[in-house]
Interface confidence: low
């Protein structure tokens, strides 16, 4: 006979991300007796909720809440009966919620009542839903993307945790109603705001980050497509030979095409748009989006907003990762300076529907808004956030690391579960358990 | 090509039960919610509920809550509808409908895209 | 609940003809769909979302309106047109149909 080691008991946890086009579930696992260590914790399982995100539930919240019940069911599956009690469940909504928090208080706040009652009926630890600030949603992904990728410390072979020479990654989250720049800074931020003091492992992080509200792929598009009706009564970001009965109710509904409303617009009319595949208008139409025009700060990204110059490696993720990898693999464009990714969103842009289609085969949802976004992506990258042909050398476009999706999410549960310790680790021998 | 059929029409006794099928082909059962709909005669169309086959969840209309009960057998790829303590006003020919849905902007849309045959039931001494 | 009210119960029409029928909403809704249905058979949808037309349904029915009024139009209609149309909203739980208009060829 001879002695087996048993694999160490584990503990698990549950954050549902409840963005503004849908919520996912995400549950982590990690050893319990290595709770304090880094890159330990990492994705056991995810879930993709049916339908919109828990914002869209605004007339019918308890919808909102029955929308979750199939990947909370999943849960019950994925953890282990006896762990069910201990495993913390959070739940955490973003710029959807914020805006629609904005506009409708009393519904935002319906529909997170209608998701706690939900959550509270599982035997899971529940410890909240709550909306989260752009700050807090940049930040937290900027802690998951560095943690997964073990920028904070790392086990060395001489028996001891060390902090790693290559320092942190800069972040980049785009999602559907803001997108998110958070990155190491040495000099303190000239707008307060902008800034956040982590000390994890014992070291100190002075951390730019900003949430730009209204600038998400989905609200991005909306907004382009209320500046096409407005200024050209055709979208030259969509294909030609692309057509569409547009209602204008839904068009100027979001807080973030209100500048763009007209003042006595019939809410329910619809026009119809067509596409006329010009990149150029394209460019001209998203230029829009941005406003460098006055910035109170010694140096700005835009409209108004201080940012230090981007400096260090970036991982951009969630829309940034899908426009790109559009790009790359579906239309098989080079994407890896910023002059082939502008080259390729002129590539897509040029495009007609029948060409689109036959490029993309399968009909992909959305085939027509991709020239918008890669544009949008472009621009963004190299006019609002700044980034040079050196400093986007640095830019890796990444939808998972270690197996662990890229996101705010795991971020906010190490930070709620306290995974992540203040103080610097003491000597400990790692053990392997794969 | 998606389709789905349901059992022949039954005739009953009031205050007896009846179970009625409705099997799919031609998609994948678990991707999709399953809706019971009554058309009782000269009536409007009526929603009694749903269940998501994938997760055995059911949702009722309040009218319907006590009188039907919706199942799935996901290996035969077929939802079922049980109906009790049956009475004359329950007469009607009931529809099962797959839930289809898109999303547009971040907001889900819902309708029945396809529809079966539909299965009269008649309450009669 | 919300009730749909659909009007006019019966309508005659003959073929070439433009028509309108419409549905009324007790409150709000987001959007509404239409459905056919000829006799002796099950209903299949025409529109979904208030103008989307359904897979395999010919461009002379359009779809429109907003809040608590909507319409459904045939440009030309058609002897094989002669059915019931019900609207249906999925914006308030539970989900409900309006009484249908049904349409006579002349």
């Known amino acids: 006979t001879r002695d087996v080691r048993e694999p160490p008991a584990l503990k698990y946890g549950i954050v549902l991300d409840a963005g503004s086009s849908h919520t996912s579930m995400f549950i982590y696992k990690w050893p319990a007796d290595k709770e304090n260590d880094t890159g330990i914790v990492g994705q056991h399982s995810s879930c993709d909720v049916p339908g919109g995100g828990i914002s869209s539930y605004a007339d019918n919240p308890s919808g909102a809440s029955q929308s979750l019940v199939g990947c909370l069911e999943q849960a019950l599956q994925d953890v282990p009966k006896e762990r069910h009690a201990g495993t913390p469940l959070y739940l955490g909504a973003t710029a959807g919620m914020r805006l629609l928090n904005l506009t409708n208080p009393e519904a935002s706040t319906s529909v997170l009542m209608a998701v706690t009652h939900t959550l509270t009926q599982y035997p899971f630890d529940f410890r909240g839903a709550r909306i989260l600030s752009g700050q807090e949603e940049g930040v937290f992904g900027w802690v998951t993307a560095n943690y997964l990728l073990e920028n904070f410390i790392k086990y060395g072979w001489v028996g001891r945790w060390f902090r790693p020479r290559k320092g942190t990654l800069g972040a980049m989250d785009l999602g559907g109603a803001s997108t998110q720049i958070t990155f190491e800074t040495t000099s303190p931020a000239e707008d307060r705001a902008s800034e956040v003091q982590l000390h994890l492992y014992g070291q100190h992080y002075r951390v730019y980050t900003h949430s730009f509200l209204c600038y998400g792929r989905d609200q991005v598009l909306q907004r382009l497509l209320a500046s096409a009706l407005q200024t050209h009564g055709f979208h030259p970001c969509w294909p030609r030979g692309f057509s569409t009965q547009v209602l204008l109710g839904d068009v100027y509904q979001s807080p973030c095409t209100m500048a763009q409303r007209p003042q006595n617009f019939n809410s329910s009319a619809r026009v119809s748009l067509s596409g006329s595949s010009d990149p150029h208008l394209c460019r001209d139409l998203v230029s829009g989006l941005f406003s460098f025009s006055s910035c109170p700060f010694s140096r700005c990204s835009f409209n108004g907003v201080f940012q230090p110059p981007v400096a260090g490696n970036f991982v951009a993720f969630s829309a940034f990762f899908y426009t790109v990898d559009f790009l790359r693999t579906s239309m098989g464009l080079p994407v890896a300076t910023l002059q082939q990714l502008e080259a390729a969103a002129v590539n897509v842009c040029n495009q007609t529907w029948a060409q689109l289609q036959a490029r993309v085969p399968g009909q992909r949802a959305r085939l027509a808004d991709y020239c918008a976004g890669a544009m949008f992506v472009q621009q963004l990258l190299s006019r609002g956030y700044g980034f040079d042909e050196r400093a986007f050398g640095g830019v890796i476009f990444q939808k998972k690391a270690a197996d662990t999706a890229v996101g705010w999410a795991l971020g906010y549960m190490l930070n709620l579960t306290n995974l992540i310790p203040a103080d610097p680790p003491g000597l400990r021998k790692g053990t392997d358990f794969s | 090509q998606v389709q789905l059929v349901q059992s022949g029409a039954e005739v009953v006794k009031p205050g007896a039960s009846v179970k009625i099928s409705c099997k799919a082909s031609g998609y994948t059962f678990t991707d999709y919610n399953m809706d019971w709909v009554k058309q009782a005669p000269g009536q409007r169309l009526e929603w009694i509920g749903d269940i998501n086959p994938k997760y055995d969840i059911s949702t009722y209309n309040q009218q319907f809550k006590g009188k039907a009960t919706i199942t799935v057998d996901k290996s035969a790829s077929t939802a079922y509808m049980e109906l009790s303590s049956l009475r004359s006003e329950d007469t009607a020919v009931y529809y099962c409908?797959?839930?289809?849905?898109?999303?547009?902007?971040?907001?889900?849309?819902?309708?029945?895209?396809?529809w079966g045959q539909g299965t009269l039931v008649t309450v009669s001494s | 609940e919300i009730v749909l009210t659909q009007s006019p119960a019966t309508l005659s029409a003959s073929p070439g003809e433009r028509i309108t029928l419409s549905c009324s909403a007790s409150s709000s809704v987001s959007y509404i769909h239409w459905y056919q249905q000829k006799p002796g058979q099950a209903p299949r949808l025409l529109i979904y979302s208030t103008s989307n037309l359904a897979s395999g349904i010919p461009a002379r029915f359009s779809g429109s309106g907003s809040g608590t009024f909507y319409t459904l139009t045939i440009s030309s209609v058609e002897p094989e047109d002669a059915a019931v149309y019900y609207c249906h909203q999925w914006s308030s739980y539970p989900w409900t149909f309006g009484g249908g208009t049904k349409l006579e060829i002349k």
């Open positions: 409908a797959r839930r289809g849905f898109f999303l547009y902007y971040g907001i889900n849309y819902y309708y029945f895209d396809v």
